[in-house]
């Protein structure tokens, strides 16, 4: 059987992303999210 390992040498990078609330709604201020591995998760 094939053995799958998680330490394959790939790093999962994360980056803080900031959006303006008015771009996605009508509020003021900034919205801070987190992108992990190319996906915005928060």
């Amino acid at each position: 059987d094939a053995e799958f390992r998680h330490d394959s040498g790939y790093e999962v990078h994360h980056q803080k992303l900031v959006f303006f609330a008015e771009d996605v709604g009508s509020n003021k201020g900034a919205i801070i999210g987190l992108m992990v591995g190319g996906v915005v998760i928060a």
Epitope: Q15, L17, A21, E22, D23, V24, K28, A30
Partner: nanobody
Framework: QVKLEESGGGLVQAGGSLRLSCAVS????????MGWFRQAPGKEREFVGA????????YYADSVKGRFTISRDGAKNTVYLQMNSLKDEDTAVYYC?????????????????WGQGTQVTVSS
């Protein structure tokens, strides 16, 4: 095609102030989110701050928060970067940049319009 042109750079003493301007032409100013970046010699271009399309919201990098202020004038199609309490480490080429609505404001790849840059040198 949208064109951005910065002005106002120069040599200033540490602790001093400078105001950069960025004139926007060739596009609908109110639909473009504007930001400022800077690049010091031998370093990557870094985010300084941004202002929303309406001008109601701003966001700044921690390194300039409380010292730099971004504003925009819709009548003049111009964005300003007011820089106070300048430090040696603020020495860089400063770029204004424009991005489509809905994109992240703090990363370079969101911005598809760039000015040519203006040099700011802080001397102690």
């Amino acid at each position: 095609q949208v064109k951005l042109e910065e002005s106002g750079g120069g040599l200033v003493q540490a602790g001093g102030s400078l105001r950069l301007s960025c004139a926007v032409s060739g596009g609908t100013f109110s639909s473009i989110g504007m930001g400022w970046f800077r690049q010091a010699p031998g370093k990557e271009r870094e985010f300084v701050g941004a202002i929303s399309r309406s001008g109601d919201s701003t966001y700044y990098a921690d390194s300039v928060k409380g010292r730099f202020t971004i504003s925009r004038d819709g009548a003049k199609n111009t964005v300003y970067l007011q820089m106070n309490s300048l430090k040696d480490e603020d020495t860089a080429v400063y770029y204004c940049a424009g991005r489509p609505a809905g994109t992240a404001i703090n990363i370079r790849r969101s911005y598809n319009y760039w000015g040519q840059g203006t040099q700011v040198t802080v001397s102690s």
